[in-house]
């Protein structure tokens, strides 16, 4: 068995995807391992090769079908296991039980795009990407907004306690260039966590109108 | 804090199935991630599963190859521990632990993670 300085850890996109995440103290960088997912009342079972990330974690997605398909439900119970070859055979590394829904991690959200923009303000617009249609709703967003001169972890959140996919930014600087930055969460699960953030979208707000109070 | 008590052991044919339970008072159950653990004679105290807070994610000891299934029923304040294809190796006392720091369900915990435990419960498994 694995001892506690090994670690796996994995998420569900909500639709078709499970990406994990495997950690081992003193793993051989070479050694092949995979990762084996079989769902409790599904016909199908899955499998990914585990690559290295870095000195000793390694990661893989399981790609359960077409990206949109909904591939798992809230009941569904994924029984999750590490094989590594050891010879000729493979030797079971660690097995976890996983509600897929209690584990949540969606994908990053897509297609930023400007709406309107003004010299003190911006409406921006996203779209999520392979989100079940379970959640109606019930899902959170955050923000964030980079200024010239500092960095993102300095930006503050802005939260968004609802489905809501817009925003309007207020109190910029006019003429000046911005980058912005959103994610989003499903609000069940044990697990569940931020997406990763989008891609940065740039903008630009419009100048000051000469000789005009704006 | 809670206190637990073991129930569902017995002797059963190899081949055959049992189902431990472990009932838990006098605390919040869901503030415990809660596990099993086995220990026959003359050996030390073995990991058998463990589950998180909520059920999220529950860990299994390799050595039950997929046989055994540990799941909680947190408004019966109950975890319980589905054994099948019960081998006489498995022959043990079993007994359910709760651990009262955070447990993320991501990796194999130690026995002495766990903070309060209960009397056990004797398997015994006939060849």
């Known amino acids: 068995a694995v001892n506690g300085t090994s670690q796996f850890t994995c998420f569900y996109n909500s639709r078709a995807n499970i990406s994990c995440v495997w950690s081992q103290d003193g793993a051989l960088q070479d050694t092949s391992c995979q990762v084996h997912a079989w769902p409790d009342r599904r016909r199908w079972n899955q499998t990914c090769e585990l690559l290295p990330v870095s000195q000793a974690s390694w990661a893989c997605n399981l790609i359960l079908g077409a990206p949109d398909s909904q591939k798992l439900t809230t009941v569904d119970i994924v029984t999750l296991r590490v094989l590594c070859r050891e010879g000729v055979r493979w030797r079971v590394m660690a097995i976890q039980d996983f509600k897929p829904f209690e584990n949540l991690r969606l994908m990053a959200p897509i297609s930023l795009q400007v709406v309107h923009v003004e010299t003190h303000r911006c409406n921006i617009s996203w779209e999520i990407s392979q989100a079940s249609h379970y959640f109606e709703r019930h899902l959170e967003f955050e923000a964030r907004t980079l200024s010239p001169g500092h960095t993102w972890e300095e930006a503050p959140l802005l939260t968004l306690k609802q489905k809501q996919e817009w925003i309007c930014l207020e109190t910029l600087t006019p003429d000046t260039q911005y980058e912005f930055q959103v994610r989003v969460k499903p609000l069940q699960g044990e697990f569940t966590t931020w997406s990763p953030w989008s891609q940065p979208l740039a903008f630009r707000t419009k100048p000051a109108a000469l000789g005009k109070d704006t | 804090q809670v206190q637990l008590v073991e129930s569902g052991g017995g002797l059963v044919q190899a081949g055959g199935s049992l189902r431990l339970s472990c009932a838990a008072s006098?605390?919040?159950?869901?503030?415990?991630?809660m596990g099993w653990f086995r220990q026959a004679p003359g050996k030390e105290r073995e990991f058998v599963a463990a589950?998180?807070?909520?059920?999220?994610?529950?860990m299994y000891a390799v050595s039950t190859e997929g046989r055994f299934t540990c799941s909680r029923d947190n408004a019966k304040n109950t975890v319980y521990l589905l054994m099948n294809s019960l081998k006489p190796e498995d022959t043990a006392v079993y007994y359910c632990a709760a651990m009262t720091s955070y447990y993320s369900g991501t990796y194999y915990p130690d026995s002495s993670d766990f903070d309060i435990w209960g009397q056990g419960t004797q398997v015994t498994v006939s060849s």
């Open positions: 006098g605390g919040t159950f869901s503030s415990y991630a």
């Open positions: 589950t998180t807070r909520g059920g999220g994610r529950t």
